[in-house]
Interface confidence: low
C-alpha cells in the first residue's frame, strides 16, 4: 500500500498499540452540499418494494437518531398495483459506523461501533434450492 | 429531552465549546454478531433494479474503503428478463458518518464527516410531469 508521511503538525500521542484512542472533532464537515436531501425522499413510496421509515433513537449513541427502513410487503407491487408474491421485497442493509458513549453517559468519550441498518427495500426474484 | 446524569468515571475534558474534541476508542464493537453477512449479498444481482458495487478508497478516511452502488440500467428488469423503460432503477442513498484525518496524514486526529453513499438500487414508478 501507499505510505503517507506523517504530518509533523499532528497532535502528540502514544499510538503504538491497538485498541487505540484518537481525538475526534465532532464539528461535522458535510460533503453533501450539492445534494438535494429531498432527492430520494419519495422513493420509499414509489418503489415496487415500498418501505416505511421507523425512528430509532438512542441517547448513548452519536448520531442519536437513525431511520430504519421496513419493507411494507412480503411481495412486490406489480403493474396493476397489486402485491405479487412471486417476487420478494427485501431490505437493503448497510453496516455503518456510530459513536457509542463509553463509559456510558460521558459527553466526551466514545467507542466506535458498527451497526447494521436497513436503508430501503428492493424487489428480488426468489431462489429455490432444489434438494436432490 | 431526558437529562442523563454524567458518569463520574468519565475522562476529564474541557467540553464547554463547540466544535468540541472527544476521545474515541477505535477498537470497533460490532453489534451485528447475529446477522449473516451473506444474507443480502446477492440482492445486487437478483434485484429487478440490479446494481454493481464500486470500491471507493481514501487513505485519509476511516473506514478507508467504502462500496458504492451504481444502478446497471435506467429501467428495471421485467418478468421476461428485459429492461422495461417504463420503470426506473434509482439509487437508495444514505448519509453516513466517517472519520477524516485532520490535519491530513495524522494517525490519531480526526474530524467527523458526513458523506452520501449509494447502498443499492430500487425500482420506482416514474413521475411524469404533464405540461399544460
Amino acid at each position: 500500500g501507499i505510505t503517507i508521511p506523517r504530518n509533523p503538525g499532528c497532535p502528540n500521542s502514544e499510538d503504538k498499540n491497538f485498541p487505540r484512542t484518537v481525538m475526534v472533532n465532532l464539528n461535522i464537515h458535510n460533503r453533501n452540499t450539492n445534494t438535494n436531501p429531498k432527492r430520494s425522499s419519495d422513493y420509499y413510496n414509489r418503489s415496487t418494494s415500498p418501505w416505511n421509515l421507523h425512528r430509532n433513537e438512542d441517547p448513548e449513541r452519536y448520531p442519536s437518531v437513525i431511520w430504519e427502513a421496513k419493507c411494507r410487503h412480503l411481495g412486490c407491487i406489480n403493474a396493476d398495483g397489486n402485491v405479487d408474491y412471486h417476487m420478494n421485497s427485501v431490505p437493503i442493509q448497510q453496516e455503518i459506523l456510530v459513536l457509542r458513549r463509553e463509559p456510558p453517559h460521558c459527553p466526551n468519550s466514545f467507542r466506535l461501533e458498527k451497526i447494521l441498518v436497513s436503508v430501503g427495500c428492493t424487489c428480488v426474484t426468489p431462489i429455490v434450492h432444489h434438494v436432490a | 429531552g431526558i437529562t442523563i446524569p454524567r458518569n463520574p468515571g468519565c475522562p476529564n475534558s474541557e467540553d464547554k465549546n463547540f466544535p468540541r474534541t472527544v476521545m474515541v476508542n477505535l477498537n470497533i464493537h460490532n453489534r451485528n454478531t447475529n446477522t449473516n453477512p451473506k444474507r443480502s449479498s446477492d440482492y445486487y444481482n437478483r434485484s429487478t433494479s440490479p446494481w454493481n458495487l464500486h470500491r471507493n478508497e481514501d487513505p485519509e478516511r476511516y473506514p478507508s474503503v467504502i462500496w458504492e452502488a451504481k444502478c446497471r440500467h435506467l429501467g428495471c428488469i421485467n418478468a421476461d428478463g428485459n429492461v422495461d423503460y417504463h420503470m426506473n432503477s434509482v439509487p437508495i442513498q444514505q448519509e453516513i458518518l466517517v472519520l477524516r484525518r485532520e490535519p491530513p496524514h495524522c494517525p490519531n486526529s480526526f474530524r467527523l464527516e458526513k458523506i452520501l453513499v449509494s447502498v443499492g438500487c430500487t425500482c420506482v414508478t416514474p413521475i411524469v410531469h404533464h405540461v399544460a
Epitope: 408474491y85 427485501v90 431462489i127 | 444474507r39
Partner: antibody
Amino acid sequence: EVQLVESGGGLVQPGGSLRLSCAASGFPFSTYAMAWVRQAPGKGLEWVATIRGSGESTYYRDSVKGRFTISRDNAKNSLYLQMNSLRAEDTAVYYCASPPQYYEGSIDRLWFAHWGQGTLVTVSS
Amino acid sequence: AIQLTQSPSSLSASVGDRVTITCRADESVRTLMHWYQQKPGKAPKLLIYLVSNSEIGVPDRFSGSGSGTDFRLTISSLQPEDFATYYCLQTYSYPFTFGQGTKVEIK
C-alpha cells in the same frame, strides 16, 4: 430437527378471548415468516395469519381481521395468536406452521413445510 | 381472494392405481402452488412445493405438474399408506387459500 409445539387451546364462550402459543426449535426462528392455519372439525384447511421474521409485517384473513393478532418473540423462539371476540365459527384445531429451510428466496418463505400437532379451540356457550 | 377448486372431492381407488387430482385457480398463481397430504387426527404433510418439486422424503410416486391456473397431483401407483385427504395451497396472493380437499378412499 424442526419442532413446533402449540399450546393454549381450550373451551371459551362466544365473545371471549384466548391466546395460543407456539414454541419453535431446530431452526433460526427470527429469519423465517411464520403462520397459523386452522381446521374446523370435519372441514378443510384455512390459512389464518402470517407474520414476517422481524415481526414488522402481519397478514390476516378477512374474517379474523381486527379480532386476532399474530405476534412473535424472537428472543423466546415463540409465535403467538391472540384471539379476541371469539365466535362459534372460530372453533377449530389451530396449527402453527413454518416454512422450509432449503428455500432462500429472501427472508421470507411463504408455504408451510413444518406443522405443529395442533391445539383445539372450542367456542361454545 | 383467489379461489381453488379441487376435483374430484372424493375418489375410490385400489392399491396400484394411478390417481390424478386437479386443482383449478380462478386466476393465475404463477408457480406458487403446493400440495399436502393429511391423515385423520394428524397435521398436514407437505408433498410437493412450487408445482412440481418433491419435498424431502416424499416417495417419487407423487408428482406435480401444471402452470398458471391448472395444476395436477399424480400418484403413479397408489399404496395403502396413501389413503388420505389431499389439499392444494396457493401462496401467490393473500389471503392464502387451500382447495376444499380430495379424499382418496379404498375401493
